[in-house]
């Protein structure tokens, strides 16, 4: 017989030879990191037809790492179903808890023993330090020193000393989230007031108000014979400016050569003013949104 078969889990005892006589026996032992469990044979014989009698390494089992229990408030998940060396053990924590330590342990061979690559991690309760205090405002539960996962606080602004109120810019409610951090940055309390939006040759049609504070929304339409250059809807933003900017009402001209009358409003002007009907969504000059205002 030629050289005997080789296996993943067991190796030949002694040195292999190039040829073996009929009837000659070779013995195997489990490789390092494997251990033998009877009754399967671990030897073979050179048969008279010059082949080796059937033999397998199925009696050699991989060394196994010790069983690890689920961490408290968490779970240990075997990536490939067994504790044999080469295995990966993944750890996750329940909602509201975070991992201290390594989230993956590997079953490794040290000499002939299978051991885990580190200590199992712990699952600790997610806690947040108090959220930031803000100028001109406050938050609920200001006396609490430690917040648990999903605990929420709500911010509100103080009464303003002047005629204009403080507006709350940002999220009014934030909660203690993953990584022991708050879900959003603390909001800001400040006076946000946009200037009165003046549109020459047009008028405001909605969003009327004494003053225009944060998030106030205003809509416009142009007079007959004028079309809107810009957005018909503007919003007062946190920097006290309108976004998009206050639009302009430009005169509709019938030919590209017609020069539009000089207007005091600053800003770029198209040289050709298309007819109003070319602007879908905007009222034609004779179709005021609020006809009673015309």
């Amino acid at each position: 017989c030629e050289a005997p078969p080789t296996f993943e889990a067991m190796e030949l005892i002694g040195k292999p030879k190039p040829y073996y006589r009929v009837g000659e026996r070779v013995d195997y032992k489990c490789k390092k990191g494997y251990f033998y469990i009877p009754p399967l044979a671990t030897h073979t014989i050179c048969d008279r037809n010059h082949t080796w009698l059937p033999v397998s390494d199925e009696g050699c089992y991989r060394e196994m790492c010790p069983h690890i229990r689920d961490p408290l408030n968490g779970e240990a998940i075997l990536a490939n179903g067994s504790y044999e060396f080469g295995a990966e053990l993944h750890f996750i924590c329940n909602e509201g808890y975070y991992l201290i330590g390594k989230d993956i342990l590997y079953c490794e061979l040290k000499d002939t023993v299978a051991i885990w690559s580190g200590k199992p991690p712990l699952c600790e309760k997610i806690l947040c330090t108090p959220p930031p205090k803000i100028k001109n405002g406050k938050h609920t539960f200001s006396e609490v020193e430690v917040f648990e996962y999903l605990d929420a606080v709500t911010y509100s602004c103080d009464p303003a000393p002047g005629p204009d109120p403080f507006s709350l810019i940002g999220e009014s409610m934030i909660y203690c989230g993953n990584n022991s951090t708050w879900s959003h940055a603390a909001p800001e309390c400040k006076v946000v007031k946009c200037r009165f939006p003046v549109v020459e040759n047009g008028k405001q049609i909605s969003g009327f108000g004494k003053k225009f504070y944060y998030k106030a929304t205003v809509m416009f339409e142009c007079d007959k014979g004028y079309y809107l250059n810009g957005s018909d809807k503007i919003v007062c933003e946190s920097n006290s400016t309108w976004d998009p900017p206050v639009p302009k009402c430009l005169k509709v001209s019938t030919s590209p050569t017609t020069k539009s009358p000089t207007s005091s409003a600053s800003g770029p002007r198209p040289t050709y003013k298309p007819p109003v009907s070319n602007y879908p969504g905007y009222p034609k000059p004779d179709e005021g949104i609020l006809n009673n205002l015309d």
């Epitope: 946009c194 009165f196 004494k210 409003a265 609020l290």
Partner: antibody, heavy 118, light 107 residues
Framework: QVQLQESGPGLVKPSETLSLTCTVS????????ISWIRQPPGKGLEWIGV???????NYNSAFMSRVTISVDTSKNQFSLKLSSVTAADTAVYYC????????????WGQGTLVTVSS | DIQMTQSPSSLSASVGDRVTITCRAS??????LNWYQQKPGKAPKLLIY???SLHSGVPSRFSGSGSGTDFTLTISSLQPEDFATYYC?????????FGGGTKLEIK
């Protein structure tokens, strides 16, 4: 407290240009929106125009072709120029501060009478 | 332009009276209306803005109401210093326009 003071010639000849200034004391012109308003003798008030802090202007279309409102920050003054005047432009001219960007006139100058006559 | 019509153009009243002045706009102006008081030889003074908001320093006997096209200025109990001319002013649309005025005289 901000004070406004109009000044300029009390008499202007027809077809000439009326020029008035509004001096601001107790504040900077760059932070005020100013309107000019006039009142013919024994009559009501008529809005002429406004200049905003960003330098933009809006004018009453009745004066559009002959009015200019401007600001001189170095002198802390606003000015009104009205060209081609006629006797109908005889009036007390006021400068008034637009309140905080809103079109109500909270602070007024004492007014200056301009007579258009040859 | 939006025309502002005040009525009456003049009225006589006595100290202690309740007085109402009306202002009508030629088209809807929401609440974009101000009231001014002017005494002879003086500049106007802002009394009320945005229909009903009292300007600082203005006595509470002055009040304003209305919406759309019809507005009123009410003086609940006339005082001697209230005899003057009163003007309304709209600001929904350029040009901003004033009413013709209402002269309030001592009866």
């Amino acid at each position: 407290q901000v004070q406004l003071q109009e000044s300029g010639p009390g008499l202007v000849k027809p077809s000439e240009t009326l020029s008035l200034t509004c001096t601001v004391s107790g504040g900077s012109v760059s932070s005020y929106d100013i309107s000019w308003i006039r009142q013919p003798p024994g009559k009501g008030l008529e809005w002429i125009g406004v200049i905003w802090t960003d330098g933009g202007t809006n004018y009453n279309s009745a004066f559009m072709s002959r009015v200019t409102i401007s600001v001189d920050t170095s002198k802390n003054q606003f000015s009104l120029k009205l060209s081609s005047v006629t006797a109908a432009d005889t009036a007390v001219y006021y400068c008034a501060r637009v309140y905080d960007g809103y079109p109500w006139f909270a602070y007024w100058g004492q007014g200056t009478l301009v007579t258009v006559s040859s | 332009d939006i025309q502002m019509t005040q009525s009456p153009s003049s009225l006589s009243a006595s100290v202690g009276d309740r007085v109402t002045i009306t202002c009508r706009a030629s088209q809807g102006i929401s609440n974009y209306l101000n009231w001014y008081q002017q005494k002879p030889g003086k500049a106007p003074k802002l009394l009320i803005y945005y229909t009903s908001s009292l300007h600082s320093g203005v006595p509470s006997r002055f009040s304003g109401s209305g919406s759309g096209t019809d507005f009123t200025l009410t003086i609940s109990s006339l005082q001697p210093e209230d005899f003057a001319t009163y003007y309304c002013q709209q600001y929904i649309k350029l040009p901003w326009t004033f009413g013709g005025g209402t002269k309030l005289e001592i009866k």
